[in-house]
């Protein structure tokens, strides 16, 4: 018996050869003996089958002796044995349909977890063979599960179900909601314009949810809210924003926050939570500021950075086209009796210069000038 | 019987894009998986890339800047792209198809051999 | 990435022989690992698939078996044709190759 596979939703075409090369009477039946259709002459006539509707044949083949049976838009329950009757015999075809599909939806929240379900016949014993997009292989039965979704999860699934040595293959586009980003730092001068800027990775028609920024400060001893809004078709609404400080943001994607002034005070990490309309679950993406400060005091020129530095990071004090005269992995430094001239303060991570902050030092009679 | 065949240059000039196409005969391109292997001359075997039933593609992330992958399903054809060659690049490369998506290649090309030299 | 090894680069064996060639895995590849044969005029073969189903044609002398980062190729009895040089490769993600046991005739 010959076995084919089909596909839910798909088109099959079960073939039936005769011997003689020309038109003559065939029929197919199903395993109950109910007739699906046959000829009459140059006619195709059709029996009482619930395939009725959606199976057809390819007149144009029959007088090469081939008389197909074409069954569109398969289900699952279509699964059965189809029996083609020509010249006295009997060709016997079983048809396994599949269906493969991700639960529930197809945009799924960074960390979610994507389940697919295979539908098969009862009686079958498929396993399935699915790749991610980034080329890892899972496999599985019935259902096929991948927990913590990663952005790189995002595309095109590709799936083979195999039984009997004997193959269907799936395609399932999945969409992985995320920031593009989990996590970014921005470095300014004290005093400096600070941009927040949160990417999304994707791209949906209409976009529509709440958000808020929540700001734990270095100095300060819990977090709290800066700002709350309303996200709808992808424009961007100010719901509540604190008084200090006064946060702008954004009114179109991607979601852009502008913080006038930094200063040590703001210094510190945020988070900020994106609820999606009809998602459980939110998207976060932190964010962090760190502050630098260089200031001259009497004969004490230090520099200073306020927020979340790696201890790798190093901090120097030099005068411009000179050796570092001080440099730490510390968050302060200072150097006494600075010589007159224009002073570096330097905050770098493997040499790369992160952040960099100039002061002018006048001959001690002279007030210091920033430039 | 499903039988690859890979052709074009045997000798390609350092810099240049080497280009390879594998023609697939006893199956359609527009079902399994179909990858390129090369061999280096002391038999390390790399795997370079695939492209899929789906259209989709993956490569090798060492080669990611410099590769590309394509298809034509009216010839029944896969091609290979490998931009800004070296010396290093010279291999026997094989094209091959994986049927049930294991990466486990069931049928190879006899290779061809590509020299990168001035 | 995942790295898998080959321990042994050659190995000498006598015709009726039972041959075992292993190969690791730098983590679980949850029996994704393929074995294949090159013979000495460049002819590649898939030989064993997903640690140990038979591909079509392939005799059953070579057998396969392993789980999570260990696996090994049998060859039940060494016959004349076998003399090649065996690769195992993962593809639990995108595939890596063992550096190659060259098996020749004692």
């Known amino acids: 018996k010959k076995v084919v596979l089909g596909k839910k939703g798909d088109t099959v075409e079960l073939t039936c050869t005769a011997s003689q090369k020309k038109s003559i009477q065939f029929h197919w039946k199903n395993s109950n003996q109910i007739k699906i259709l046959g000829n009459q002459g140059s006619f195709l006539t059709k029996g009482p089958s619930k395939l009725n509707d959606r199976a057809d044949s390819r007149r144009s083949l029959w007088d090469q002796g081939n008389f197909p049976l074409i069954i569109k838009n398969l289900k699952i329950e279509d699964s059965d044995t189809y029996i083609c009757e020509v010249e006295d015999q009997k060709e016997e075809v079983q048809l396994l349909v599949f269906g493969l599909t991700a639960n529930s939806d197809t945009h799924l929240l960074q960390g979610q977890s994507l389940t697919l379900t295979l539908e098969s016949p009862p009686g079958s014993s498929p396993s399935v063979q699915c790749r991610s997009p980034r080329g890892k292989n899972i496999q599985g039965g019935k259902t096929l599960s991948v927990s913590q979704l990663e952005l790189q999860d995002s595309g095109t699934w590709t799936c083979t179900v195999l039984q009997n040595q004997k193959k269907v293959e799936f395609k399932i586009d999945i969409v992985v909601l995320a920031f593009q980003k989990a996590s970014s730092i921005v470095y300014k001068k004290e005093g400096e314009q600070v941009e927040f800027s949160f990417p999304l990775a994707f791209t949906v028609e209409k976009l529509t949810g709440s958000g808020e920024l929540w700001w734990q400060a270095e100095r300060a001893s819990s977090s709290k809210s800066w700002i709350t809004f309303d996200l709808k078709n992808k424009e961007v609404s100010v719901k509540r924003v604190t008084q200090d400080p006064k946060l702008q943001m954004g009114k179109k994607l991607p979601l852009h926050l502008t913080l006038p002034q930094a200063l040590p005070q703001y210094a510190g990490s945020g988070n900020l939570t994106l609820a999606l309309e009809a998602k459980t679950g939110k998207l976060h993406q932190e964010v962090n500021l760190v502050v630098m400060r260089a200031t001259q005091l009497q004969k004490n020129l230090t520099c200073e950075v306020w927020g979340p530095t790696s201890p790798k990071l190093m901090l120097s004090l030099k005068l411009e086209n000179k050796e570092a005269k001080v440099s730490k992995r510390e968050k302060a430094v200072w150097v006494l009796n600075p010589e007159a001239g224009m002073w570096q303060c330097l905050l770098s991570d493997s040499g790369q210069v992160l952040l960099e902050s100039n002061i002018k030092v006048l001959p001690t009679w002279s007030t210091p000038v920033q430039p | 019987e499903v039988q690859l065949e890979e052709s074009g240059p045997s000798l390609v000039k350092p810099s240049q894009t080497l280009s390879l196409t594998c023609s697939v005969t006893?199956?359609?391109?527009?079902?399994?998986?179909w990858n390129w292997i090369r061999k280096f001359p002391g038999h390390k075997l790399e795997f370079l890339g695939y492209?899929?039933?789906?259209?989709?593609?993956n490569y090798n992330p060492s080669l990611k800047s410099r590769i590309s992958i394509t298809r034509d399903t009216s010839k029944n054809q896969f091609d290979l792209q490998l931009k800004s060659v070296t010396t290093e690049d010279t291999a026997t490369y094989y094209c091959?198809?994986?049927?049930?998506?294991?990466?486990?290649?069931?049928?190879w090309g006899q290779g061809i051999s590509v020299t990168v030299s001035s | 990435d995942i790295y898998v090894t080959q321990t042994t680069s050659s190995l000498s064996a006598s015709l009726g022989d039972r041959v075992t060639i292993i190969c690791r895995a730098s983590q679980d590849i949850n029996n994704y690992l393929n074995w294949y044969q090159l013979k000495p005029d460049g002819t590649l073969k898939l030989l064993i698939y997903?640690?140990?189903r038979l591909h079509s044609g392939v005799p059953s002398r070579f057998g396969g078996s392993g789980s999570g980062t260990e696996y090994s190729l049998t060859i039940s009895n060494l016959e004349q044709e076998d003399v090649a040089t065996y690769f195992c490769q993962q593809g639990n993600t995108l595939p890596t190759f063992g550096a190659g046991t060259k098996l020749e005739l004692k």
């Open positions: 006893g199956d359609s391109i527009t079902s399994s998986y």
């Open positions: 997903y640690t140990s």
């Open positions: 492209i899929s039933f789906a259209d989709t593609t």
């Open positions: 091959a198809r994986d049927d049930f998506g294991y990466y486990a290649m069931d049928y």
